[in-house]
């Protein structure tokens, strides 16, 4: 269909910082350190190509990637095709956010990332860690008092833990915009509902207990017309890909070398297997440590605390996708009536979970209504 | 409801070998995951071999070299077979299939390897 991929892009073997500079934009780069440690990278593109001497403080943005990704998702289309630039365009002051365990957040001031305690982190360890330590950095940086929060995927997970459980953070957030949101995942068709009954040890056993890799436990779901196809091998033996679905019909094929060398970015198979504990409670809840006394020691209480997002009383807009096979349409459903300050939603029958950073209608379907209301927010 | 059934344990000399079978009463080709668990004695029950329906395999250090796992799903049977044993060995021996529907054991067989 499109034979063998070469890697003509040359963002291939770029960093975030070079990434950004290629496509001509200021950037500037920083370590964030969290409060167990954690030194994660954070870049900013302070303004736009052709905005640059407009003075007085704007609005910022701060963009959260999602599972097994990096801050790179929204820097890899073309600039009028990439959020991060289309948003520093239109004159915002841009932050890109980076989770811990992925490529540009694997540091820590006391473990090295070759010990398993250095990988002993999930979801929730993002949301009460990472998230605060980030845009507490931004709001000392700029010195604005509130942010735009744009999340995808689990970048929308860690923001309702988080401004749910943390009413201080929660008051520095101006709007938050949600692609592709996940918060319970009991209708996901994802490859990773194939893992639901699979015990921890057995689990830890097949992929260890540091960064996930996906073995080849996928590979026996794999074998499908889609998967024979020779562009689609490369995507099918890619973990995000693999966990997130994918339609080739949307995406930019010359930029899939990006795509590829820049994905899965990595995260914990401890953060893998709270995905799959999600997946077989149905429930949105703390990471189940696998016995009552050890969720003692770490809750206080036998089972694992369920997250309400009933108690996040920041203004949210939702885009979700009718294609989405990890944030289901089903479990977006369950969701949006349990927001209390739900300003906006729209559902895009044809999209899928990664169409919502990478789709070449992505401006037209998304990022253009996210521009116009972050301006309406201004007046 | 998948059943497993173990089977082929006993009382083995250091440096010999056993084939433990499992037996399934539904089909096993549908299994994600087929695996043997060992529980030493006073210890917990933990992995030592597991075979995805790939075909891929994944050994746990203290066997690796030394056991194989194998499935034969015309049969629904998954097989352990196991060399030059060492009374480390020693235990209980469990199969495991996880599926679409859950996760299933066996009931466990009995592995004694005398010095």
């Known amino acids: 269909l499109f034979g063998k991929l070469h890697p003509g892009s040359p963002e291939v073997t770029m960093n975030i910082s070079q990434m950004i500079t290629y496509w001509g934009y200021p950037n500037e780069e920083y370590e964030v350190v969290t409060e167990d440690g954690y030194i994660l990278e954070v870049n900013r593109i302070p303004y736009g190509k052709k905005n640059s001497g407009n003075t007085g403080q704007r609005p910022v943005v701060f963009l959260q990637h999602g599972l097994l990704a990096s801050a790179t998702n929204w820097i890899s289309n073309l600039p009028n095709n990439s959020l991060a630039f289309i948003l520093a365009d239109a004159g915002y002051d841009v932050w890109l956010g980076n989770s811990r365990g992925n490529t540009w957040a694997r540091r820590n001031l006391y473990y090295s990332p070759d010990s398993v305690e250095f990988w002993a982190f999930s979801f929730d360890e993002m949301a009460k860690y990472d998230l605060p330590a980030t845009i507490d950095f931004i709001v000392k940086k700029t010195g604005q008092k509130q942010l735009h929060y744009v999340g995808h995927s689990q970048g929308t997970t860690i923001g309702f833990i988080a401004f749910s459980t943390n009413p201080s953070l929660a008051k520095r957030i101006k709007t938050f915009y949600a692609l592709a949101p996940v918060a319970t995942v009991k209708y996901t068709k994802s490859l990773i509902n194939k893992l639901r009954f699979v015990p921890q040890s057995l689990f830890k056993f097949i992929f260890g207990d540091k960064i996930f890799y996906p073995h080849n436990f996928f590979d026996q779901f794999l074998a499908t017309e889609v998967c024979s196809r020779e562009m689609l091998n490369l995507l099918c033996s890619n973990a995000l890909f693999i966990i997130c679905g994918f339609d080739s019909k949307n995406f930019n094929t010359s930029r899939l070398d990006v795509y590829l060398s820049h994905n899965p970015a990595g995260t914990s198979v401890q953060n893998m297997f709270h995905w799959t504990q999600a997946v077989k409670s149905g429930k949105f809840q703390a990471y189940d440590w696998g016995s009552p006394v050890q969720n003692r020691m770490h809750y206080d209480q036998s089972q694992p605390p369920y997250y309400n997002v009933t108690a996040m009383n920041v203004p949210i807009a939702v885009w979700n996708g009718g294609k989405d096979l990890l944030a289901d349409p089903q479990d977006v459903g369950l969701l949006l009536p349990k927001l209390p300050n739900l300003i906006y939603h729209k559902e895009i029958p044809f999209y899928n979970h990664l169409d919502f950073i990478w789709a070449m209608d992505a401006p037209q379907e998304v990022y253009n209504d996210i521009v116009s209301m972050i301006s309406e927010d201004k007046k | 409801q998948v059943q497993l059934q173990e089977s082929g344990g006993g009382l083995v000399q250091a440096g010999g070998s056993l084939r433990l079978s499992c037996a399934a009463s539904g089909s096993i080709g549908s299994m994600y995951v087929m695996s043997w668990y060992r529980q030493a004695p006073g210890k917990e029950r933990e992995p030592i071999a597991a075979?995805?329906?790939?075909?891929?395999?994944t050994y746990a250090d203290s066997v690796k070299g030394r056991f194989t796992i194998s499935r034969d799903n015309e049969k629904n049977t998954m097989y352990l077979q196991m060399n030059s044993l060492t009374p480390e060995d020693t235990g209980v021996y469990y199969c495991?299939?996880?599926?679409?529907?859950?996760?299933?054991w066996g009931q466990g067989t009995q592995v004694t390897v005398s010095s």
């Open positions: 495991a299939g996880t599926g679409a529907e859950g996760h299933y």
């Open positions: 075979l995805m329906g790939s075909g891929s395999t």
